[in-house]
Amino acid sequence: QKYSQLLEKKTTKELVHTTLECVKKNMPVEETAWSCCPKNWKSFSSNCYFISTESASWQDSEKDCARMEAHLLVINTQEEQDFIFQNLQEESAYFVGLSDPEGQRHWQWVDQTPYNESSTFWHPREPSDPNERCVVLNFRKSPKRWGWNDVNCLGPQRSVCEMMKIHL
């Protein structure tokens, strides 16, 4: 189904993404509802994810996400994180939306989701340095696993953006 056809009743919406990939949802009412992600984004649960191939600082990565009506990834569940890991390249590191602005080890998610120490995925001996105030997902070979690492925010890395699915 063409995006232009889906948009017949949505003409007032300001568009950032010109092409959406949509899945029809079974709705109890007569109207058909479509659940969409922008083209080239990954779909999981109620969200869409964009995995960058360009490197930028954490601050610029956050703005790059904002330009796409998204924000840096906020990890809410183990399942969400495992899905993301499946789509990352092991030789790269990826900024997420977790930072420690004051260097006091007061971690904050960009969307104000409370930071829960009991559901974190730090690599062993991380976080390691209060001057490293931004978090990346990276892969370590020993032991072989993905996890979180604190890094300098001004060092360029890839990133993961997240947005809620678009419903038509």
Epitope: S57, Q59, E62, K63, A66, S99, P101, G103, N131, R133, N152, C153, L154, G155, P156
Partner: antibody, heavy 119, light 107 residues
Framework: QIQLVQSGPELKKPGETVKISCKAS????????MNWVKQAPGKGLKWVGW????????TYVDDFKGRFAFSLETSASTAYLQINNLKNEDTATYFC????????????WGQGTTLTVSS | DIQMTQSPASLSASVGETVTITCRTS??????LAWYQQKQGKSPQLLVY???TLADGVPSRFGGSGSGTQYSLKINSLQPEDFGNYYC?????????FGGGTKLEIK
Amino acid sequence: QIQLVQSGPELKKPGETVKISCKASGYTFTNYGMNWVKQAPGKGLKWVGWINTFTGEPTYVDDFKGRFAFSLETSASTAYLQINNLKNEDTATYFCARGNFRYYYFDYWGQGTTLTVSS
Amino acid sequence: DIQMTQSPASLSASVGETVTITCRTSGNIRNYLAWYQQKQGKSPQLLVYNAKTLADGVPSRFGGSGSGTQYSLKINSLQPEDFGNYYCQHFWSSPYTFGGGTKLEIK
């Protein structure tokens, strides 16, 4: 407390070179970008560009590409602005300013360095 | 590049009055906007960031508002120390340009 202390006033002739310093204290230098701002006499503020204090990568506004150069002495928490082949229109006060951690707005400023270029 | 149009260029007001300075941008900057105050012979000082958040130590008579392409700085009950120059600046995309400035003078 956080401070940015700049070098003193400079009087130069056209064609000469000047190097202005900005020494930071009270915070971890490599965690915040350093910006440079120009203010000609009686005029407004113009952003010259910034230097990434972690990677050393400079970014210059188009109007200031060529003769302007940013550099760092990280061990001394100091940023530098060098202007080559000085022209009369470079006469201005130059400010260094720290870029905020998350949004880049300029949260701390140096006191300014007055540069006068005159033959 | 995003252009910044600040108005008025100058403004005369009396102590106790309320004044508003506006900044219009050529594109949506999503609240990535700061306001600075500069006194004669001094360096600028941050007043407001993210369009509406007051910087530490800034009196509550200052207030920022706006969204999209239209932003304003309001100063209630002007005090003698409020007179000087005011500048807006965006941080949405490089170059991070300043507005032309507003000179606030005592009437």
